[in-house]
Structures are given as structure tokens and as C-alpha cells.
Amino acid sequence: GITIPRNPGCPNSEDKNFPRTVMVNLNIHNRNTNTNPKRSSDYYNRSTSPWNLHRNEDPERYPSVIWEAKCRHLGCINADGNVDYHMNSVPIQQEILVLRREPPHCPNSFRLEKILVSVGCTCVTPIVHHVA
Amino acid sequence: GITIPRNPGCPNSEDKNFPRTVMVNLNIHNRNTNTNPKRSSDYYNRSTSPWNLHRNEDPERYPSVIWEAKCRHLGCINADGNVDYHMNSVPIQQEILVLRREPPHCPNSFRLEKILVSVGCTCVTPIVHHVA
């Protein structure tokens, strides 16, 4: 990896023992300066593999609300608005980091956690299994 | 929101002043017990709106490596393998939380940051602009 010289102004609280505990400022900086006009706003409805968004709430997690996509159909929507079963609607999944309160119910002590979320759906050609 | 009784065993380091600083254990707990076999592994190639994955690396960020999807085509791939320009390949974007080293180059001091990432692509019907 890349070695970065340590800033002499860093808080002096490093612990060599794992689990490693660090200080995190929860005042979120929003870097979403993405100017791409193609934002995901209504794609869930206009997609050939449309999806519904389900609210997943957990007060012990930060962020407490995560939206999960569930594909509406097994197949994909064709030009006539019908479901084509020779194609598959599948969820696009991503691993994201969240903060889990640890010990539970503590307002200022967390553990990093990786969770898998479905962000949306895409239409794929199925894998055909040939029988010998 | 939901009020949670505070655990008496919590570390006593709460600061009422924003920016709020918390302790985070970086020993990641992986909750990916998802048994769904439809993982996003090869969807980027099999999708009717295929995408390429570009590595975005930043040693000042945790995680330092994030993969960004870029749709391969303006339109979507049809059954003949040609591009259908009457459909659009669009990126599915998601806001995720990352940790940004703050002050820079500090190994144990971070600030939460929201960034927008493109996770994959989906095929959508275009918005038709009707001329009066």
C-alpha cells in the first residue's frame, strides 16, 4: 500500500492492539458534487427490470434507515410492457459500511460493520445450463 | 425518532457540542450472511446495460478502494447483440458513508463523509420530450 507520513498534529490515541479504536467526527461532509444529470431518481419505475424500495430501519445502526431494492419481476419488461421470462431481473448488490452501536444503546461508541444492500435491479441474460 | 435507554456500561465520552466525536472500533464485523446465490459477480457482463468497473483509490479514505461503474453503451444491448438507441443505459447511484482521515494523514482520526457511487447500470425507457 501507500505509506503516508503521519501528521504531527494527530490526536495521540493510537492503540496498537486490535480491535483498533479510532475517533470519528459524525458531522458529515457531503462530497456529492456529481454533476451527472442521469441521477437514479425514477429509474426504479422506468427500468426494464423495475424495483420497489423497502425501508430497513435499525436504531442501533448509523445510518438508521437504509433503502433496499427488490426486483418486481422474475423476468424483464419488454417493449409491449409484458414480462419476458427469457431474461432475468436481478439485484445489483453492494457492500457498504455502517456504524453499529457497541455496546448496544450507546450514543457514542460504535463498531464498523459491512452489510450487503441491493441498490437496484438490472436485466441479464440467463446462464443456460446444458444437460449432457 | 425512537428513544433508546442508554446502556450504563457505555464509555463516558459524550460531547454535547457538534461536531460530535465518537469512538469507532475498526475491527469490521461482516454481516453478509446473504445466502442469495444471485450475487452481482458477472452481472456487469451479462446485463443488457453492461458496465465496466473502475478502481478509485484514495489512501486518505476508508475504505481506500472503491469500485465505480461506468455504463459501456449509450443504449442497451438487444437480443442480436446490437445497441438499441431507443433505450438508455444509466448508472444506478447510491450514497455511501466513508471515513476521511482528518486531520490528513492521521491513522486514528476520521470524519464521516457521504459520497455518491455508481454501483451498476440498468436499462430504462427514455423520457420522451413531446414538441407542442
Epitope: - | H73, Y85, H86
Partner: antibody, heavy 110, light 107 residues
Framework: EVQLVESGGGLVQPGGSLRLSCAAS????????ISWVRQAPGKGLEWVGS????????YYADSVKGRFTISADTSKNTAYLQMNSLRAEDTAVYYC???GQRYAMDVWGQ | DIQMTQSPSSLSASVGDRVTITCRAS??????LAWYQQKPGKAPKLLIY???SRASGVPSRFSGSGSGTDFTLTISSLQPEDFATYYC?????????FGQGTKVEIK
């Protein structure tokens, strides 16, 4: 002003090579395909190929597949058409054009 | 590939005439059809996109119609600067294909 400027044409022997350039200005280069269209003397328009600048995908007419290569340098806002193994029937005026899904080929080189 | 057939291949007309050029696609292309005008020694110029929408700066005497497989370009009152060759193009799917062109000449 939105414009495309081609360069690099010339006289070449059969079997030879030539590279054409298409410099774009005045628009977001990555939101479109850049298409190459040719016109043989006294004939109609023929699509040669395209490049989707954002995704990097390239497309070719069967008549040039394997001989012509389209590429782009997004830092220079320039697309290229590399023509190898040239034949007499490739003799034509070559145009580059901006292609979008809504307006088709709305901007052409000179 | 989608074939585009234009007719007529050439026509003679006078200033002030109403001129109609037709274009037929080998399969349905919805409204993904464009019309271009080309004058000798010049690059083509977009006239109509989406079968019926006029491109910026195109005079109102030019109009397009049709959907599916049959399309028409109409010049309501031919002007001296309209003598040129006109091409239709489908952009429904790749490969992009053009009609063979219609040359409008002075009678």
C-alpha cells in the same frame, strides 16, 4: 460554440494506413458517441463506426471491421479513426459527427 | 440490420412547389428517424429528428411525419436554397443506417 474539426486526410497507396482526428469543443465530450460517416465520390452516406466516449465502447460497420480502429483521448476532447489495410473502395470524404439518442447526428465536422 | 429505402431517388421541382420525400424502414423504428440535407462539397445538416421535430434554426417549411416503418419529409414551398440531396437515417438500433438519398433538382 459547439463544433467538430477533422484533420489528417490525404493520399495513400492501397494497403497503406492513415489516421484521422476529430477535435470537439463546446460540449461535454463524454455524453455522446462520436460517429464516423463517409461518402464515396458521387455516392450516399455510409456509417463507418462510432465510439461511446463515457463507456469506451466502439462499434464498426462490417465493411471496415478488423481494418479500422476508433479511439479517443478525452483529455484532448479528440476522437481518432485509424485506417489500416486501405483499399480503393475506402476512397471517400470522411466526416465525424456527434451522435445522441435524442437528436441523432446534430453536429458534423466540416 | 435495418434497411432504409428512400423514394424517389431524384426529383425535379420548381421554386414554390410542395415536395414530398418518403422513407421506409425494413422494420419498425418507432420515431427514431432523422432527415439530413446535404449540399455539394458540404457536410450534411440535421433537419428533422424524432421523425417530426425540427432541429434548431431549420425553417418551418420543412416538416417530418410518420412512425413505425413509413416516414415523410415535406417541403411546403420549395426555395432556391433547398435544392440539395436529402437523406433519412434510422437511429433505433445499431448499426446506424441511411437511406440512399433523394436529389432535389431545379426543373
Amino acid at each position: 460554440e459547439v463544433q467538430l474539426v477533422e484533420s489528417g486526410g490525404g493520399l495513400v497507396q492501397p494497403g497503406g494506413s492513415l489516421r484521422l482526428s476529430c477535435a470537439a469543443s463546446g460540449f461535454s465530450f463524454t455524453s455522446y458517441e462520436i460517429s464516423w460517416v463517409r461518402q464515396a465520390p458521387g455516392k450516399g452516406l455510409e456509417w463507418v463506426g462510432s465510439i461511446y466516449l463515457w463507456g469506451g465502447s466502439t462499434y464498426y460497420a462490417d465493411s471496415v471491421k478488423g481494418r479500422f480502429t476508433i479511439s479517443a483521448d478525452t483529455s484532448k476532447n479528440t476522437a481518432y479513426l485509424q485506417m489500416n489495410s486501405l483499399r480503393a473502395e475506402d476512397t471517400a470524404v470522411y466526416y465525424c459527427a456527434r451522435f445522441g439518442q435524442r437528436y441523432a447526428m446534430d453536429v458534423w465536422g466540416q | 440490420d435495418i434497411q432504409m429505402t428512400q423514394s424517389p431517388s431524384s426529383l425535379s421541382a420548381s421554386v414554390g412547389d410542395r415536395v414530398t420525400i418518403t422513407c421506409r424502414a425494413s422494420q419498425s423504428i418507432s420515431s427514431y428517424l432523422a432527415w439530413y440535407q446535404q449540399k455539394p462539397g458540404k457536410a450534411p445538416k440535421l433537419l428533422i429528428y424524432g421523425a417530426s421535430s425540427r432541429a434548431s434554426g431549420v425553417p418551418s417549411r420543412f416538416s417530418g411525419s410518420g412512425s413505425g416503418t413509413d416516414f415523410t419529409l415535406t417541403i411546403s414551398s420549395l426555395q432556391p436554397e433547398d435544392f440539395a440531396t436529402y437523406y433519412c437515417q434510422q437511429y433505433y438500433s445499431s448499426p446506424l443506417t441511411f437511406g440512399q438519398g433523394t436529389k432535389v433538382e431545379i426543373k
